[in-house]
Every structure is written in structure tokens, then in C-alpha cells.
Interface confidence: medium
Amino acid sequence: DTHKSEVAHRFKDLGEEHFKGLVLVAFSQYLQQCPFEEHVKLVNEVTEFAKTCVADESAENCDKSLHTLFGDKLCTVATLRETYGEMADCCAKQEPERNECFLQHKDDNPNLPPLVRPEVDVMCTAFHDNEATFLKKYLYEVARRHPYFYAPELLFFAARYKAAFAECCQAADKAACLLPKLDELRDEGKASSAKQRLKCASLQKFGDRAFKAWAVARLSQKFPKAEFAEVSKLVTDLTKVHTECCHGDLLECADDRADLAKYMCENQDSISSKLKECCDKPLLEKSHCLAEVENDEMPADLPSLAADYVESKDVCKNYAEAKDVFLGMFLYEYARRHPDYSVMLLLRLAKAYEATLEKCCAAADPHECYAKVFDEFQPLVEEPQNLVKQNCELFEQLGEYKFQNALLVRYTKKVPQVSTPTLVEVSRNLGKVGAKCCKLPEAKRMPCAEDYLSVVLNRLCVLHEKTPVSEKVTKCCTESLVNRRPCFSALELDEAYVPKAFNAETFTFHADMCTLSEKEKQVKKQTALVELVKHKPKATKEQLKGVMDNFAAFVEKCCKADDKEACFAEEGPKFVAASQAALA
């Protein structure tokens, strides 16, 4: 349905508060280096303009597209060329090329300082002094660091952030109340950002067919009682929502997400018995709740799939008639029966089934050719099952920190060309799969682990695309979305890699090490471990363990010394020499 003024339409649909929040997020995700005040000024100008269009949709410029309006506004920033370099060239383009240009310049790893958390009293004062500015600052700081963060979900995070301060700044022990809530929001926010980044990568790099396949599998697991038609409708709508958000169309995305939540709540009976408690909540919470809702129970008497997808003589006829629909139905049927499989495994099975039909439907006896297709699934199913089993055993044996170290060594040997900070970040996150998934019952382990790993490996792919250094990484990242994790798992020690020259500076430490938090200490040690492996890729586990144990002892000793800096200066070179000898 067309509207005379798109900006007026969205302002009226979303309301002023959400409109302003979403425009701030959009601008912050595009111009990640701009100061907060600049963005607030732009947002206020856009909001005032939107209000004039609400009052009179025929007013000047009100008929322009949102991309035109927002792009024109972004291009008024005076320091565009100095701050962003070639991104300023986007402003010479016409829509839709200009928006595409801005999208291409989004930076997944912007050169921004890490967010420092002030003292609780300082934060509470700022919150009370100007709550609106305080919350806008939160949206701005998160959005500029996470340029693909799911915008309507970020509004939900901001609402929780506000609620945490409103409650805790009145508590007797403000810090005890507030800090765990902020930690939880930070961790959930990072996870949400990474999950959304995979959705956007799926859409942008592999197309909407790939995203729709993912959505069919996931929604069929969540809503196994829903009919295929219902799942198809939800998939179509969800694809539109995510296409819009990933494309920077945040107002449309938020509006369509609200419509989808409304539809789901009005049609609970034909979707899932689990939606009821979500549907009683206010909008932002409702949408979040629906996205995270647990799987419904599987219908009791689902027949075997073999009858329709293997035994039927009409398989090739049906496949030929509408390939994607037939494969979609196969995926739906398989996924609703297997909440215990990862989405990526289900997609691999659908790909294998498709490949078999492509081959067999051209054969002399198609039925004979595809009769054993389900048997071919067995190795595909067993591979992630074994991987999860082995890695959970390793995690339980080592604990999280040492499990991360094992992964650091494993991945540095596979792709030693990748930058050390990236290897540390990715391996630390890969290692978190243990605590996240290994405690779950068997039936939930694989979907938790493999789908989480897909999210983490996407982060590696996104960072690597910005600065490509390894053909092996490029190959695993670009050849097949569903086979990324098996592709990385299959990589061996890179025999062609020329070991990095030893640099004593890399292994020189100072007294500031002692004041670091436990997490920061771990990162320092893990950075050293990656550098060691890059220097000696063929070092054994035992050799590396010996060096790392010595390192921990050396740091502990010097942090207990009266003159810490002198200790580091004296003991450091000894540690380096001993390490070189141990690895020789």
C-alpha cells in the first residue's frame, strides 16, 4: 500500500520515540566515527521534518524516499571527506546506488576505543540528570560499534538498560544491583549482534534463497505443529524484515517486525502453543520473546518421510514441477521431526537430497537411483554428533580457559596468516561453546553448538573479508554457507606457512600486567600463545603447555614482587630464553 509521504507513514506507525531511536541507530551505523552531538542534531532535524510531513503530506520533499531523505542528511556532514575518506564519494551518487555505497562502507571492526564503564555513582548521576540523552548515548555507542545490530532489538536492549538504571540507582547497594544487569546486557548484546551479522551475511553473500532455507528449517523446528503454508508465510515475512534491516531500512524493518508479531499473536492457534505468554507483553518485549520462543512439542503421530520423499514414484515429477517448493516441504518435514539437529545440518541434508534428485531424476531408473538417499544422510548426521561429543569431553576435561587455548592452537595452526587479535577473539568465542552448550541434554547439544559455531565463524569471515590474508579462509567462507563449519574443521596444519620470525618485543611484559582484570590477563596470555604457535607451528601440545605454565609462573612471581617492574625486566628475558630453548 503506497503512501504519499513515506516518512510521515513511518513516523505515525512507529511513534516519535521509536522513530527517533531508529533514525539515530541508522545514522550511527552508517557514520560510525561521527561525534554523538552531530548525530543528535541530524536526528532532530529529520524528526522535525517528519512532523511537518505528518501535518501535511503534500509539503515540500515529503514525497521523497527515506533513502533520499536520510542520504541527503548524511551528506550534509561537513567533515565527511576528512573522517571517512572515500566514503564521501557515495554522496556523488544517486539513489539507490548511494545507499548501496554507504552499506559497503560499514565497518565491522571500527577503530573505536573500547567502552569504559564509569563508576556506578557517575552513571546514576548522568542517568538522573538527563535520562533521554543517557539512553541516546547508549543507542549511539552500541550502533556505531555494531553496524548490523538488529535495530528494533536494540530498542529493546535500550529499554532494558533504562529499566536497570531506574531500578538500581534507587537501590541500597547500587553496584550490586546494577553491575550484573549491565554484564548480562553486554553479553546478550554481543551475542545478538553476532547472530544478526550472520543473517545479514547470509542475505548479502548468499541471497534470500539461503536465508529462506535457514528460516524454513528454524521455524519448522520451533513450530512443528504449524502447516507448511503457515511456516512459508512466516518465512516470507521474516525474510522481508531482515532484508530491510540488513539493507539499512530500519524504519520499514521495525514497522514490519511489529506487523509480524501482531500476525503471530492473532494466529497463535495455527502456529504454536508456546506463543501465549509472549503475546501478553508490550511490543518490544513481545517481538523479542517471539524470536526466542522455545520449540513447541512435535505432533504425536507424524508419518515417515520415506513414503513421500523416497518411496513415491512421483518424486521426480513433483520435484520438476516446483523444485524450491518441493525442497522447502522436504526441509519443513525433516526439521519439524528433528529439533535435535542443528539448522546447518538440516540444510546440508536438504542440499544432499537436492543433489541426489538432480542426479537421479535424469537417470534411466530414477526410483532405483534415489531409493537409498536417506542412507546417505548418516555420515552427514554423525559428523557433527561426533564433533560435539569430542569437544564437550575436551571442555569438561580442561575447563573453559584451557579449552579456549586448545582451540587457539588448533586454529592458529590451520590459518596462521590471520591476525593475532582476530585469532584470539574468534578462538575465545569458539571456546565459549563449551559453557553454553555442553551442560545441555543430549537432544539440545548439537543445535546449540553447531549453530553457535556458525555465528562465531561468520565473525571470522567478516573480519577476514575486510583484510584477506588466507586463501583457505576465503575458500571456507565463500564456497558454501552451510559447509563453513565442516570446512574449517577439516583444515589441517598449513604446511605452506613460513613461520614468523621470533620477536622478543612480542614476549616482553611489564608491571601493568598485574593490574589487569582476569579476562584481560587471559587475553594477554592467549595473545602470547598465538604468537608462539605462529613462530613454531609444529610445536607439540606438551611443549606449548610447558611454555604457558612457565609464563603463568613468571607473571605470578613478578606480580608478587615488591619491585614488579624490575622483576619483569630481569625475569622476562630469562623466560624468553627458556621458551626458545623449550621450543627448539
Partner: nanobody, 128 residues
Framework: QLQVVESGGGLVQAGGSLRLSCAAS????????MGWFRQAPEKEREFVAG?????????DYADSVEGRFTISRDNAKNTAYLQMNNLKPEDTAVYYC????????????????????WGHGTQVTVSS
Amino acid sequence: QLQVVESGGGLVQAGGSLRLSCAASERTFVAYAMGWFRQAPEKEREFVAGISWFAGATTDYADSVEGRFTISRDNAKNTAYLQMNNLKPEDTAVYYCAISHQLPGGRPGRDMDSYSYWGHGTQVTVSS
């Protein structure tokens, strides 16, 4: 929500022909079985014809219309058709198009409960 709209009904003499159309609002229409039902005054609604979820697949007819009626579908147009030849006065009824999601297989059922979405019907009157 999937919408179903019938058209093509009207008044025709016995022995004449009519072609009913049933348009569905969604592309995923291709995945459903389609059925035509009819209801004469003071009578129960009854199955007339069905076609399974792909154009090349199964069709099914009530004994009373077998050989006279033909069901077909055009997936590209999200539309199903009922070609009715050699019409008889007893064919007079409101004709309803219905879409089924019964899976797996999407075979055309004869049972009304197999069909989830219904049109409002189109009147067919056959005069003698």
C-alpha cells in the same frame, strides 16, 4: 492470511459448459492441494474434484461428475480451474474452492476437514 476467491459462475442451460476459476493470494499456493466442493439448497456440502499439490500430480473426482468435469491448475497464476461440461440441472449449487495443507504428500482429500482455507463461493444454476 491466504485469501481464496472463486469466479466464473452463472446461469447456463442443461448440456452447456462453464469454467470456474479459483485464485489464491500467495505464491506458495503451489504447495497445496486444491479442492472444489458444492452445496445445493437444503443439502450438505459435498466434494466435487481435487488436485494435488503439483500440476503434474493426482486428480480425483466425485462419481457424479467423473468424465464431465476437469480440474486443473496454473501454478504461475496461483489459480485452479474447474471446467464443467455437459451440465445437468442437478449440478445447480454454490461451488466453493478450498485449499488444503495436509502434509506430507498434499494429496487431494475428499473430506472437508482436510481443507483449511475456503472461498465465499460462486453460484452455478443449470436450467432445463
